[in-house]
């Protein structure tokens, strides 16, 4: 190389990581087992669990805005499912990123838009509960299910915009043991006169503002908005918080336990470009912290079915009848399901978001064990405790 | 060709300042990070001041800190030592070296002696 | 500060023998090290950076290594411009401090 061919610029933390180098060390080989294992569970489970809430709550539920954000916060959950394949494929190969630098870019942008529109429609679920308690007669004008789309399109266009900066920072960069990362690069873009100015300022920037719009600001909307309601709910007299207060509530602790670590890690990395001391210890911890918060899209389906009243009785005491009614053969059935279909409401406030999703009253073979989770296969489709917990609009 | 010629060295008393230059030339200085490394006579090799490629960050050692200042002008392709209070330990040759990237002394200057003596 | 034990601090060799210099951080420095060569009367030239890494125009009978606190020069066949004192650095939190230097001398 002559000597005025100047080195892609790298920031001193990012190319303190490009030196370091793999173990092969057996215990640490165990390790990445274990983790390529852990992954490879969580991707299927999370791909599986989220595909089956949003068909499920799409296509086989009364839409209500309740089961809107859900829809929309399952979409976001799938999208990071889909995502986590690839990761455990990087974690497989060694922790080396051999899919290219576009796809590094999408990749990585997936997390953060996953990141920030979980964030935000938490946000969105919490608002608007305040507003049904606070503004009851507001609420019931204005809380509509096509309402409730236009805030998530706008949530999701929020949420696009702060991932821009992921995407436009991120990039490949090669180890010199040969295996290569997709990290931030934050001089890839106009570096400016001074590298180490440019990298404290922009790496800071980063962390500070995920942390505050896709985690503090979220957190404090929820807090804000739970105390309201619990304040106005308290001079009505109700003590006993409804079934879709509780899912809202195991969501959203999940969320917090499981972006929470990320947060902090993010933010002693910021600190560790003027700190090198930091370096070593968020260089352990982020691919930890970063796992636990790819979990959250894993947990929050597992959520929804848990914290829905009866699930677990229902689930022992039916279990024998459900794969009786799955393995019937579909000739065994009959036609009548076919021909009989639930009419659905014209009005914006339960019309399906999915127009595609037809819904028939007693679905056939693998639908029927859907069916199930959310009711009685044979009875309405809002019987079931999940079902009801996402119906409920008032509680 | 890279090239780094440093001057402005000599004799000083103690107490006494003195600033050193270093002229760079064959490539785009105002992209590199700089430093100051100095060598007591027979003695082994020191770190003294680092600044990065556009000068906002500056390090140093303790044994020098407060007392030493780099600098630099990206449109003279010069780095500058401006050494203050000197005692007779600072009594060594200069040199000013570039870093390959962030760090990594990738090239030298010959270096220009400072005597420090009464 | 980060303290740099450069061992032997001299060594006599012939040419064509096999060197090895080695040099131990007080603390773990994940393979920010370097290694420089310098001749008497001229400024130091890099050796090896990162640790393992060759710099531009070094012979490929000079290599590295290591990892934590201990790193080593190697040297797989002495030549006679070989002969100079080496100093290993370490770049993880500063001050960057220099081994005392170990002089590879003519047997």
């Known amino acids: 190389m002559s000597a005025n061919a100047t080195l892609k610029p790298l920031c001193p933390i990012l190319e303190q990581m490009s030196r370091l180098q793999s173990h092969s060390n057996t215990s640490i080989r165990y390790i990445d087992h274990a983790a390529v294992l852990l992954h490879g569970l969580a991707s299927l489970l999370g791909l599986v669990e989220n595909g089956v809430i949003l068909f499920v709550v799409g296509c086989r539920m009364r839409q209500t805005v309740v089961t809107t954000w859900v829809l929309h916060l399952a979409l976001s959950d799938l999208l990071a499912s889909a995502s986590l394949p690839f990761f455990t494929y990087f974690l497989a190969v060694g922790h080396s990123w051999e899919l290219g630098t576009t796809f590094c870019k999408l990749h990585s942008s997936i997390f953060f838009l996953n990141m920030f529109a979980s964030g935000f429609l938490l946000s969105a679920i919490s608002l608007d509960r305040c507003l049904q308690v606070v503004r009851p007669v507001w609420a019931q004008n204005h809380r509509t299910v096509a309402a409730a789309h236009k805030v998530c399109l706008v949530l999701w266009a929020l949420a696009v915009l702060n991932t821009v900066p992921y995407f436009v920072f991120r990039d490949t960069i090669s180890r010199l043991d040969g295996r290569i990362m997709c990290y931030y690069n934050v001089l890839l873009l106009n570096p400016g006169p001074d590298r180490d100015a440019t990298c404290n300022s922009r790496q800071a920037a980063l962390a500070v503002s995920k942390f505050l719009l896709a985690f503090l600001v979220p957190l404090a909307i929820i807090a804000s908005s739970h105390a309201a309601v619990s304040l106005r709910l308290q001079h009505r007299g109700r003590r006993r918080p409804g079934r879709f207060v509780r899912l809202v509530a195991a969501v959203v602790a999940a969320f917090a336990l499981c972006w929470g670590p990320y947060h902090v890690f993010s933010l002693l990395e910021a600190r560790a470009h003027a700190n090198p001391g930091l370096r070593p210890l968020v260089w352990r911890g982020l691919p930890f912290v970063t796992s636990l918060a790819f979990f959250n899209s894993v947990a929050n389906p597992v959520l929804y079915v848990l914290t829905c009243p009866d699930m677990l009785r229902k689930l022992r005491r039916s279990l024998r009848t459900v794969l009786e009614s799955v393995l019937v053969d579909d000739s065994e059935l009959g036609g009548a399901g076919s021909s009989r279909r639930r009419r659905t409401s014209s009005t914006a406030r339960s019309a399906s978001p999915l127009a595609l999703c037809s819904r028939p009253e007693e679905p056939r073979g693998p639908a029927r064990l859907l069916g199930w989770l959310l009711g009685s296969c044979a009875a309405s489709p809002q019987t079931g405790p999940l079902n009801r917990a996402l119906s409920s609009t008032s509680s | 060709e890279v090239q780094l010629v440093e001057s402005g060295g000599g004799l000083v008393q103690p107490g006494g300042s003195l600033r050193l230059s270093c002229a760079a030339s064959?490539?785009?200085?105002?992209?590199?990070?700089m430093s100051w490394v100095r060598q007591a006579p027979g003695k082994g090799l020191e770190w003294v001041a680092y600044?990065?490629?556009?000068?906002?960050?500056?390090d140093y050692p303790g044994t020098v800190e407060g007392r030493f200042t780099i600098s630099r002008d990206n449109s003279k392709n010069t780095l500058y030592l401006q050494m203050n209070s000197l005692r007779a330990e600072d009594t060594a040759v200069y040199y000013c070296?570039?870093?390959?990237?962030?760090?990594?002394?990738?090239?030298w200057g010959q270096g220009t002696l400072v005597t420090v003596s009464s | 500060d980060i303290q740099m034990t450069q061992s032997p601090s001299s060594l006599s060799a012939s040419v064509g023998d096999r060197v090895t210099i080695t040099c131990r951080a007080s603390?773990?420095?994940?393979?920010?090290l370097a290694w420089y060569q310098q001749k008497p009367g001229k400024a130091p030239k890099l050796v090896v950076y990162?640790?393992?890494q060759l710099a531009d125009g070094v012979p490929s009978r000079f290599s590295g290594s290591g990892s934590g606190t201990d790193y080593t020069l190697t040297i797989s066949s002495l030549q006679p411009e070989d002969f100079a004192t080496y100093y290993c650095?370490?770049?993880?939190?500063?001050?960057?401090?220099f081994g005392q230097g170990t002089k590879v001398e003519i047997k």
């Open positions: 600044i990065s490629n556009g000068g906002s960050t500056t």
């Open positions: 070296a570039r870093h390959r990237t962030n760090w990594d002394f990738d090239y």
């Open positions: 064959g490539f785009t200085f105002s992209s590199y990070s």
């Open positions: 603390e773990n420095i994940y393979w920010n």
């Open positions: 990162a640790a393992t």
């Open positions: 650095q370490h770049f993880w939190i500063t001050p960057w401090t």
